[in-house]
């Protein structure tokens, strides 16, 4: 186990896991709304308001290289940004019948910890990634993916499950985080915002990206998800940020072009198999890694998160299609389906590359670098 083993908490109520409420613009809280007491930012989260720049203080960020066509996270300006002003507590909903995690939604009642107590745990996801504070771990080797290039047949299920669009993956997609850390891919899904509003789950220095892809994996040490939940390293998620670029992304178009068929909550369609690895960044060697949780109920902890440093580019039209096609519960648009960032509570994010060195305009400032925890791995 590369990351420190973090014991599953037995939280005593309280503790909110705020998600963004996908309300109409007119329902959004005003900027002066006070933060919710149940969800105080961790020390590593938001700074005092006097330190916050306005939007105009953020320099424009250009991709590092023309041929790569995608932004590198360490190229982002090192600025402290507030959480989105529209981040009230995100709650889950259960039908009268359901005393389980099978029925929940973004926004509404009751709070997620009442649906699943683990949602109030101390080591939750997503988190804000601060490259300057990440621990460089040379032991973190390039990710290995095998069998991700699927033939057109058999087809795969693409489903609108009411809180995301999910592609169910067949057996045989193998992924290794390193020697002896082997997984098989189960499904992938996306998180997004709304028109003019970004919707990634993880953030970088407070910067939220337009969207985020998650590929969920089960450790080969476990037979089933139910048995892996809450076990350190039982599940692993590969995450990548989606950004706006000048060209259409042909890999994503194979999925986005089918969204109209599954606009209704609970609907599904079959799509030809595709190259799943083409939905991810090309650079498997540069990434951030930490131990967190599922970002939706049951919020089980022990999940190994690997967040790519390189982003994936989609056209503006594609990002609009993603955020403006699907419908969720209660005749509401399926938008802003992301959870608010959660406090690190002492966790250290590791980087497979020296992310905190010469990577931003503020690199000259004295920074307390964390040490790598993967020694001897």
């Amino acid at each position: 186990q590369r990351l420190p083993r973090m014991q599953e908490d037995s939280p005593l109520g309280g503790g909110s896991s705020g998600e963004d409420d996908p309300l109409g613009e007119e329902d959004l809280p005003s900027e002066e709304d006070s933060p919710r007491e149940e969800d105080p930012p961790g020390e590593e989260d938001l700074p005092g308001e006097e330190d916050l720049p306005g939007e105009e203080d953020l320099p424009e960020v250009k991709p590092k290289s023309e041929e790569e066509g995608s932004l590198k996270l360490e190229d982002l300006p090192t600025v402290e940004a507030p959480g989105d002003p529209q981040e009230p507590q995100n709650n889950a909903h259960r039908d009268k019948e359901g005393d389980d995690q099978s029925h929940w939604r973004y926004g509404g009642d009751p709070p997620w910890p009442r649906v699943s107590p683990a949602c109030a745990g101390r080591f939750q996801s997503p988190v804000d990634i601060r490259p300057q504070l990440a621990a460089f771990c040379p032991a973190l080797r390039p990710l290995e993916l095998l069998g991700f290039q699927l033939p057109p047949l058999p087809e795969l299920r693409l489903r609108n499950n009411g809180h995301s669009v999910q592609l169910t993956l067949p057996p045989g997609l193998e992924m290794a985080l390193g020697p002896g850390r082997e997984y098989r891919a189960l499904q992938l899904h996306l998180h997004w915002g709304a028109a003019g509003r970004p919707g990634s789950e993880h953030t970088v220095e407070g910067h939220r990206f337009p969207a985020e892809i998650h590929v969920v994996h089960l450790s080969t040490a476990f037979a089933r998800v139910d048995e892996a939940l809450g076990r350190p390293g039982g599940l692993a998620v590969l995450a990548a940020f989606l950004e706006e670029g000048p060209e259409e992304n042909s890999a994503y178009e194979q999925l986005l072009s089918r969204l109209e068929e599954i606009a209704e909550e609970g609907s599904e369609t079959q799509v030809p198999g595709l190259d799943i690895s083409a939905l991810l960044p090309s650079d498997f060697s540069r990434y951030f890694q930490y131990e967190g949780s599922l970002t939706t109920p049951p919020c089980a902890q022990g999940v190994i998160w690997t967040v790519f440093n390189q982003t994936v580019m989609l056209s503006a039209k594609q990002l609009h299609t993603l955020s403006d096609t699907l419908w969720g519960p209660g005749d509401s648009r399926l938008q802003l389906n992301f959870r608010a960032t959660q406090p690190l509570n002492g966790r250290v994010i590791e980087a497979s590359f020296p992310a905190g060195v010469d990577s931003s305009p503020r690199a000259a400032e004295p920074v307390q670098l964390n040490s790598c925890l993967a020694a001897g791995d």
Epitope: S102, P154, N161, P170, G172, L186, R224, V225, D226, E268
Partner: antibody
Framework: EVQLVESGGGLVQPGGSLRLSCAAS????????LIWVRQAPGKGLEWVSI???????YYADSVKGRFTISRDNAKNSLYLQMNSLRAEDTAVYYC????????????????????WGQGTLVTVSS | DIQMTQSPSSLSASVGDRVTITCQAS??????LSWYQQKPGKAPKLLIY???KLASGVPSRFSGSGSGTDFTLTISSLQCEDAATYYC?????????????FGGGTKVEIK
């Protein structure tokens, strides 16, 4: 005790309909993937239909368009509506449950079914 | 569609013998394979899940192995009560029609 009990079988004419029920006790079936399996007299087991915990339903080619699997979580029951019945549908029909809670939102697949019901005989004959 | 090819279709062995039954999937199913024992007039009983894990209450003389497309059920020392028909079930997908299939069965008789 965790148990599944099928009912609803009987004699029906070709082209007729029948609805099988599978009542669960000792557990709530709402979070499980469930399956119908049949066995023609003297033959092997044949997968008929499956329903995941999101109530998405799938079928064997031999019954697609004629059979419908459904569940009623409030009644803790699984159903198989069989229409346009043929002589070759004559079999003992079993329901069975995925051995652990299903997380189909996470792409979970069943790797074994337990428990099974005792079976109910469907005879299609004129 | 997935197909499961099971062999042999029948076998006869003596008490104490080691018995091996194989199952081959038409495409990789990782370890989503289970083995069942069925006696006449009874419902199937789960023996092995996830290709190699012993179900609760099943004697340790039963074991399973394999991954991908080739799987084996072994009875290390055949007992009288093991006379039954054995089936494998492979699951490739539950999100497509015909994503699961049983093998044709192996009838085990005691000499």
């Amino acid at each position: 005790e965790v148990q599944l009990v099928e009912s609803g079988g009987g004699l029906v004419q070709p082209g007729g309909s029948l609805r099988l029920s599978c009542a669960a006790s000792g557990f709530s079936l709402s979070r499980y993937t469930l399956i119908w399996v049949r066995q023609a007299p003297g033959k092997g087991l044949e997968w008929v239909s499956i329903i995941d915990s999101s109530s998405s339903a799938y079928y064997a080619d031999s019954v697609k368009g004629r059979f419908t699997i459904s569940r009623d979580n409030a009644k803790n029951s699984l159903y198989l509506q069989m229409n346009s019945l043929r002589a070759e549908d004559t079999a003992v029909y079993y329901c069975a449950r995925d051995r652990v809670l299903s997380y189909d939102d996470y792409g979970d697949l069943p790797d074994g079914f337990d428990p099974w019901g005792q079976g109910t005989l469907v005879t299609v004959s004129s | 569609d997935i197909q499961m090819t099971q062999s042999p279709s029948s076998l006869s062995a003596s008490v104490g013998d080691r018995v091996t039954i194989t199952c081959q999937a038409s495409q990789s199913i990782s370890n989503y394979l289970s083995w069942y024992q069925q006696k006449p007039g009874k419902a199937p009983k789960l023996l092995i899940y996830a290709a190699s894990k012993l179900a609760s209450g099943v004697p340790s003389r039963f074991s399973g192995s394999g991954s991908g497309t080739d799987f084996t059920l072994t009875i290390s020392s055949l007992q009288c009560e093991d006379a039954a028909t054995y089936y494998c079930l492979g699951v490739y997908s539950i999100s497509t029609d015909d994503g699961a299939a049983f093998g044709g069965g192996t009838k085990v008789e005691i000499k």
